[in-house]
């Protein structure tokens, strides 16, 4: 987060002294995010309520200056500034000596490695002969003998520290005011010296110049007048920021402010300047933040203190230790392809002496305007700018070329840029199958747009519903099944089409109906028996566990395993036990089983059930007729049946009495050449009925039947004796 | 709680019969179908026969179709499977076990077992 | 008859993978399918019946998913105690046969 907290410590009247934040941060002030807050912390520093109430200044809202100190008592103690949104919200610390104080730190801001050793050393500025009380965040920490002084300076010394003995501390004489404390801060990084991260195992980039590595995302925090993600570039004079884009304020530049940033960088004096005032510059061979780093200039270098080694002609490098050459643009794809709407990142890698940097390399598009690179990595052997591009269109399909310049020479290389549109579905897609909890979805459609097709999106969700809708990724290639859904219910699906690429994905489709099947019949019927009622006739019952849930009736399946036929009886009745299987087979072995179905789902089968019907008989003796012999005696005659289906076994006489209501009774004739019999045993003056038919393998049609009455009035008899010739 | 109970099972002789029972408990042993389903040593489970609540239905797999009868008399609560003309192959645990009344499709009660082994 | 095939024969995974046994039908046979555990020794155990639905008192690491001839039952988090031989079996026409069984151990 680019934020910074600035101190005039020139102005000493405290009712003329102000801190200014600064957020340089890009789209700071939209107006959805929080504004800058600029307060003093008295959380830990307690100090005598201001004599009046300190007031902030806005100027835009990228800064914020506090006003309104009437004595120097209101100016000692923490200041915070906190900017940012989210995620990003940052709070910058500084801390404010009093100049009249007893004791004065030697160094302010204090950042440690974990697991390091800090010393905090506070030099006596007036003398006092009591002992010194070390406090942490306000609390009692250690104290000092007065005689313990080390050429005029206490020091703490803390070892082996971690990051929750972060904080102010401060040192102060015994029975002395607050205010004539020594305050410090001290900074300890979550991580050992070169790592960052969760378990401190990535290693940070390197930062240069006095550049602090943040323990959480690896960046390098740039002391003030540095830039560059290693913190390698230093800026023009007087300026500051991430990107060096703000200006300190005056003709006297940078001279007596003090520079606080976010942790764990802290605070220190701009470039060029050190000293308890940031007034003093630095001596010479020394540059950067608090003068801390050294130039050691070779090949007739000279030391600038803002930003180190300024080479001559043919020379560049920290230190001008590196020779010049030709920059040259390193590999790069000759063509590329992008979605239209989105904004890429274009890279381009260029080596060189002097190494190109941020302003050394610019990317210049078909329509002729150039773009600056918004990111920088340098490495040993090359630089790659990064160029952020904004929104395509396809009018920027064409030709790109990379262009980087330094004073060693230039280069440059062209690529292709293809501007594709993403595929937006035409048509919706196909339903291919349904179950009841389960759709099976073509979701192949013909697209407006470029291809190729990468990813097909499904979403689906029951009709006139609200709900949210579900999402399924599938292989365009293959059909797509929608499992887990409602039984008997419609589904509205659509499909979205990605081509490759960030920003591939396309539009809707339109969306299709499509209805899931009704429920399973889950219960298993029993066939509970079964009876031939003739050659082709079959009387089948069964029985169900229990009440069926869903079930619009019964599929009665006979299957004829010689003939490799299978014949199916669909009973529409869900209340039906019992059904009559007619027209069947005689003389066929069938596997019988029946299941519940319900729509077009089939429940699971019963147990087959093996039945055999018998074959058919011979057709129907001809020309049946009878007549009365005696009171107790009728001669029935008749004829062979035409084209019998082989040698008749016998033939079975049926006698009924005629509008009796009791069970007819049968006789056999076992000499099949007999076509003649006398019934004896009959009742007198009784009228009958008869009928007769043939058995062949199996028993034949009924014939016609005929009527006769028995003579007289006799005797009743036991019941008909048959007495049997050949007519 | 219920319980299925096999009994009947020991050594026999190629071509030899036995009559495997199963003693049902704990429920209305008559409105259930009943399941013979066995394991040969080692090797997997295998359907066997199957006989509807009232006896009237029966079911085999084929390796058995025409040597095993499956029977039952719901007055006893118990499940009979008669083993004729016995092969090697036949050799196995053979468990009873309580066929779904629908809607839950899979055996949830099963016997112990009776070990069949057919051997010279 | 139905035939019921079952993949992999055998598998080994550590403790706490996730495993997916397959079973697919030569021919559909709708939800009608059951998935039974079997420890040496012991009787089997029905895991999940019509498919997908957990038997009362399996651990919900358990699933089952699939109709018509493809079927998977999933066991999310390995428990050593889930080493066993897995079997499905279909439920559609008769004879319900069974799967040959997966073999499931430890790594």
């Known amino acids: 987060v680019d934020l910074t907290l600035l101190a005039n410590l020139r102005i000493t009247d405290p009712q003329r002294f102000f801190l200014t934040c600064v957020s340089g941060e890009a789209g700071a002030g939209r107006s959805s995010d929080p504004p800058l807050l600029l307060e003093k912390d008295d959380r830990i520093v307690r100090t005598f309520p201001p004599g009046q109430p300190l007031y902030l200044a806005r100027n835009g809202s990228h800064q914020v200056t506090l006003r309104g100190f009437s004595k120097p008592s209101d100016l000692v103690g923490v200041f915070s500034c906190v900017g940012g949104a989210g995620a990003r919200r940052t709070r910058v610390l500084y801390v404010h000596n009093s100049p009249g104080a007893h004791l004065f730190p030697d160094k302010v801001t204090h950042t440690v490695n974990k697991g390091d050793t800090a010393v905090l050393s506070a030099h006596v500025h007036k003398e006092k002969q009591t002992d010194v009380i070390w406090k942490n965040n306000g609390s009692y920490f250690n104290t000092l003998d007065w005689q313990e002084a080390d050429d005029g300076r206490f020091q703490l010394q803390l070892q082996n520290v971690q990051p929750p003995s972060s904080g102010i501390y401060s040192a102060t004489y015994l029975e002395a005011s607050p205010l004539g404390s020594a305050f410090f801060r001290l900074i300890v990084r979550g991580c050992g010296a070169g790592r960052w991260g969760p378990g401190c195992v990535k290693d940070c980039p390197g930062c240069l110049h006095g550049g602090v590595c943040h323990d959480h995302d690896g960046e390098c925090v740039c002391p003030p007048g540095f830039t560059g993600t290693r913190c390698e570039q230093a800026c023009r004079e007087g300026r500051f920021g991430q990107s060096c884009q703000e200006q300190c304020p005056g003709t006297a530049g940078c001279r007596g402010l003090t520079f606080c940033l976010p942790d764990p960088y802290g605070c220190s004096c701009g470039s060029g300047w050190r000293g308890s005032q940031c007034q003093e510059a630095c001596a010479p061979g020394h540059f950067g933040a608090d003068c801390r780093l050294q130039c050691q200039c070779q090949n007739g270098g000279t030391c600038d203190r803002f930003s180190g080694c300024v080479c001559p002609s043919g020379w560049h490098g920290v230190h001008c230790e590196k020779s010049d050459r030709i920059p040259q643009i390193l590999s790069m794809a000759t063509e590329v392809e992008f979605n239209i709407g989105t904004m890429p990142r274009i890279n381009c890698a260029a080596a060189g002496n002097p190494f190109p940097v941020r302003g050394s390399m610019k990317l210049r598009k078909p329509d002729g305007t150039m773009l600056l690179s918004t990111k920088v990595i340098v490495e040993p052997d090359r630089t790659t700018a990064e160029f952020e591009v904004p929104s395509l269109t396809l009018g920027d399909s064409g030709f790109w070329e990379c262009r980087v310049s330094t004073s060693g020479g230039q280069d440059s290389r062209r690529f292709k840029v293809n501007v594709k549109v993403p595929p937006v579905p035409l048509t919706a897609p196909r339903l291919l199958a349904k179950q009841s909890r389960q759709l099976v979805v073509s979701p192949l459609v013909s697209f407006s747009g470029d291809g190729p097709i990468s990813s097909v999106r499904l979403h689906y969700r029951p009709q006139d519903s609200t709900i949210a809708w579900s999402a399924i990724v599938v292989d365009p290639s293959e059909n797509v099944t929608l499992m887990n859904l409602k039984p008997k219910t419609g589904y509205n699906v659509r499909v979205q089409l990605s081509r490759p690429g960030e920003g591939g994905e396309g539009g809707w489709g339109p969306s299709a109906l499509m209805t899931t099947d009704c429920p399973e019949p889950l219960l298993q019927p029993w066939l509970e028996s079964w009876h031939v009622e003739g050659p082709d006739r079959l009387r089948v019952s069964w029985s169900l566990p229990s009440v069926p849930l869903s079930g619009d009736g019964f599929l009665l399946r006979l299957w004829d395993g010689a003939r490799g036929q299978e014949r199916r009886e669909n009973i529409s009745f869900p209340q039906a036990r019992t059904a009559l299987l007619t027209g069947l087979t005689p003389g066929t072995h069938y596997q019988l089983d029946v299941r519940l179905y319900h729509c077009t789902l089939l429940g699971p089968a019963s147990p087959p059930a093996h039945v055999h019907l018998p074959p058919s008989g011979p057709p129907a003796p001809r020309h049946l007729h009878a007549q009365a012999l005696s009171d107790s005696e009728i001669q029935l005659m008749w004829q062979h049946p035409e084209a019998p289906s082989g040698p008749i076994s016998k033939y079975i006489v049926e006698i009924q009495v005629a509008g009796g209501s009791g069970d007819p009774q049968w006789m056999d004739v076992d000499r099949p050449e007999e076509t003649s019999i006398i019934v004896r045993g009959l009742n007198a003056s009784t009228r009958y009925l008869f009928r007769v038919r043939a058995s062949v393998q199996g028993l034949g049609d009924w014939s016609n039947t005929v009527e006769e009455a028995t003579l007289g009035n006799g005797l009743q008899s036991e019941g008909p004796v048959r007495e049997s010739r050949a007519a | 709680e219920v319980q299925l109970l096999e009994s009947g099972g020991g050594l026999v002789q190629p071509g030899g019969s036995l009559r495997l029972s199963c003693a049902a408990s704990?429920?209305?042993?008559?409105?259930?179908?009943m399941v013979w389903v066995r394991q040969a040593p080692g090797k997997g489970l295998e359907w066997v026969s199957v006989i509807s609540p009232s006896g009237g239905n029966t079911g085999y797999a084929d390796s058995v179709k025409g040597r095993f009868t499956i029977s039952r008399d719901n007055s006893k609560n118990t499940l009979y499977l008669q083993v004729n003309s016995l092969r090697a192959e036949d050799t196995a645990v053979y468990y009873c076990?309580?066929?779904?009344?629908?809607?839950?499709?899979?055996?949830?009660?099963w016997g112990q077992g009776t070990l069949v082994t057919v051997s010279s | 008859d139905i035939q019921m095939t079952q993949s992999p024969l055998s598998l080994s995974a550590s403790v706490g993978d996730r495993v997916t046994i397959t079973c697919r039908a030569s021919?559909?046979?709708?939800?009608?399918l059951a998935w039974y555990q079997q420890k040496p020794g012991k009787v089997p155990k029905l895991l999940i019946y019509t498919a997908s639905t957990l038997q009362s008192g399996v651990p919900s690491r358990f699933s089952g998913s699939g109709s018509g001839t493809d079927f998977t039952l999933t066991i999310n988090s390995l428990q050593p105690e889930d080493v066993a031989t897995y079997y499905c079996q279909q439920f559609n026409s008769y004879p319900h046969t069974f799967g040959q069984g997966t073999r499931l151990d430890i790594k």
């Open positions: 076990a309580r066929a779904p009344r629908g809607y839950s499709y899979g055996y949830y009660y």
């Open positions: 021919q559909g046979i709708g939800h009608y």
């Open positions: 704990g429920f209305t042993f008559s409105m259930y179908g």
